[in-house]
C-alpha cells in the first residue's frame, strides 16, 4: 500500500526564480549555444515514480470495484431477506417455498401492471409527441439556407418598388461618404511622404516594394 | 438450563386481543426458530404458529392466519403471540416451544410451561 | 391437513411391564414423526424425534420406530415417573398436526 506522505509521492520542490543578469550579458547569453536542460529525475526514479502511480491507479479501480460491489450487496440484502433455517425443517421449508413462490408471483403482477403503466404513458407521450409535430407542420416554415446577398439587394427583396427611392438616397450617401473618403487618404498620404522623405526612408521603401 | 416462561394470559371477551409473552433463556435465543402450540380443555395440542430465528419468516395454520400474528425480539430474547378477533374456540393453555430440526424433521424440543387463554361471553 | 390417530386414547399397564403406543398418519410422512410426553402438572417434553432419535437427557428406556404412515412408541420396563399422556406430531407437512393422545395408566 503506497502511502500519501512517502518520497516518490512527493512533488519535487518548485526551481528557484532565475536571477536577474544585466543587460549586458544578455547578447552572449543569447548567442551562445547553452546545453539541454539536464532532467532532474533519473530514468530509474521515473519508472518508480511511473510505477507507483499505476499501483495508486490500480488500487483506485479495485477500491471502486469494491464499492460497487458493496453497493450490489447492500442493494440485495435491502431487497432479499437471508435465508433464516435454523430450527425449520421440511414441513416450514415446503410452506416457506410456497410464501416465497406466493410473493414471486405478486411481485410479477406488480411489474405486470408497471409495465402496463409505462408502455401506456409512452404511446401517450408518442401521441403527443405526433401532434406536436403535426400541429409544427401547419405552420412549417422553409429551412432557411445561408445566402451572401448584399444590404441593396436585401432591402430590394424585402420593400419591393418602394425601396427604389431609399436606394437611390443609400446610394448618394455611399457616394459623399466615398469622396470624402479619398480626401482623407490623399491628405494622410502626402504628409507620409514627406515624413519619408526627410527621414531618408523613400529610397529604402521603394527598394523594399520592388 | 432451557427455559421459557410465557406471560400475558387472562379471560376476556369474544372479538377482543391479548398479547402473549414468552421469555426465553439458558441458550443463543436468535441462533433457534421457535413456536407456540396452544393445549384446548380438550387436552388436544394444536401447533398455532413458528417464526424463524431472525423473524423473517412466519407459519400460521388456517385457523388462526390473518389473527394471530408471531413476532419476536430477538435483543429482549422474547417471543410474542398478538392475538385479534379472539373466538371461544381459542380458549386453550398456550406453550412457547424451541425449534429445532434433525435431517429436515422439526421439533419442538423445549417447552414453557404455558399461559392460560379463555375467551368466554 | 395431515390427521394423526392413536389406536387407543388410555392404556393400562404396570411398572416394569414393556408398553408400546401406535400412531397413523393419514399419508407417508417419511419419518418426520416425534412423540412427546406430557405429565400431570401439564410439563411437555420431547422424547423421540425423526422417527427414532432419542432427545438428550431422556431415558433409553423409550425406544422409538416405524416407516411411511406405522409408527410406534415403546417404553420398556415401566417406571412411576412414565406415567402421562403421550403425543405423536408429524413434522413432514404445515400444518403440523398432533394426535389426540395416549394416557397411559397405572392397572
Known amino acids: 500500500m503506497a502511502d500519501g506522505s512517502s518520497d516518490a509521492a512527493r512533488e519535487p520542490r518548485p526551481a528557484p526564480a532565475p536571477i536577474r543578469r544585466r543587460s549586458s550579458n544578455y547578447r552572449a547569453y543569447a548567442t551562445e549555444p547553452h546545453a539541454k536542460k539536464k532532467s532532474k529525475i533519473s530514468a530509474s526514479r521515473k519508472l518508480q515514480l511511473k510505477t507507483l502511480l499505476l499501483q495508486i491507479a490500480k488500487q483506485e479501480l479495485e477500491r471502486e470495484a469494491e464499492e460497487r460491489r458493496g453497493e450490489k450487496g447492500r442493494a440485495l440484502s435491502t431487497r432479499c431477506q437471508p435465508l433464516e433455517l435454523a430450527g425449520l425443517g421440511f414441513a416450514e421449508l415446503q410452506d416457506l417455498c410456497r410464501q416465497l413462490h406466493a410473493r414471486v408471483d405478486k411481485v410479477d403482477e406488480e411489474r405486470y401492471d408497471i409495465e402496463a403503466k409505462v408502455t401506456k404513458n409512452i404511446t401517450e407521450i408518442a401521441d403527443l409527441t405526433q401532434k406536436i409535430f403535426d400541429l409544427r407542420g401547419k405552420f412549417k416554415r422553409p429551412t432557411l439556407r445561408r445566402v451572401r446577398i448584399s444590404a441593396d439587394a436585401m432591402m430590394q427583396a424585402l420593400l419591393g418598388a418602394r425601396a427604389k427611392e431609399s436606394l437611390d438616397l443609400r446610394a448618394h450617401l455611399k457616394q459623399v461618404k466615398k469622396e470624402d473618403t479619398e480626401k482623407e487618404n490623399r491628405e494622410v498620404g502626402d504628409w507620409r511622404k514627406n515624413i519619408d522623405a526627410l527621414s531618408g526612408m523613400e529610397g529604402r521603401k521603394k527598394k523594399f516594394e520592388s | 438450563e432451557v427455559q421459557m416462561v410465557e406471560s400475558g394470559g387472562g379471560l376476556l371477551k369474544p372479538g377482543g386481543s391479548l398479547k402473549l409473552s414468552c421469555a426465553a433463556s439458558?441458550?443463543?435465543?436468535?441462533?433457534?426458530?421457535m413456536s407456540w402450540v396452544r393445549q384446548t380443555p380438550e387436552k388436544r395440542l394444536e401447533w398455532v404458529a413458528t417464526?424463524?430465528?431472525?423473524?423473517?419468516?412466519?407459519f400460521y395454520p388456517d385457523s388462526v392466519k390473518g389473527r394471530f400474528t408471531i413476532s419476536r425480539d430477538n435483543a429482549k430474547n422474547t417471543l410474542y403471540l398478538q392475538m385479534l378477533s379472539l373466538r371461544s374456540e381459542d380458549t386453550a393453555m398456550y406453550y412457547c416451544a424451541r425449534r429445532d430440526n434433525y435431517y429436515g424433521s422439526s421439533f419442538m424440543d423445549y417447552w414453557g410451561q404455558g399461559s392460560s387463554v379463555t375467551v368466554s361471553s | 391437513d395431515i390427521q394423526m390417530t392413536q389406536t387407543s386414547s388410555s392404556l393400562s399397564a404396570s411398572l416394569g411391564d414393556r408398553v408400546t403406543i401406535s400412531c397413523r398418519a393419514s399419508?407417508?410422512?417419511?419419518?418426520?414423526l416425534n412423540w412427546y410426553q406430557q405429565k400431570p402438572d401439564g410439563t411437555i417434553k420431547l422424547l423421540i424425534y425423526?422417527?427414532?432419535r432419542i432427545h438428550s437427557g431422556v431415558s433409553s428406556r423409550f425406544s422409538g420406530s416405524g416407516s411411511g404412515t406405522d409408527y410406534s412408541l415403546t417404553i420398556s420396563n415401566l417406571e412411576q415417573e412414565d406415567i402421562a399422556t403421550y403425543f405423536c406430531?408429524?413434522?413432514?407437512?404445515?400444518?403440523?398436526t398432533f394426535d389426540t393422545g395416549t394416557k397411559l395408566e397405572l392397572k
Open positions: 439458558g441458550f443463543t435465543y436468535s441462533n433457534y426458530a
Open positions: 425423526y422417527t427414532s
Open positions: 399419508q407417508d410422512i417419511t419419518n418426520y
Open positions: 406430531q408429524q413434522g413432514h407437512t404445515i400444518p403440523l
Open positions: 417464526i424463524s430465528s431472525g423473524g423473517s419468516y412466519s
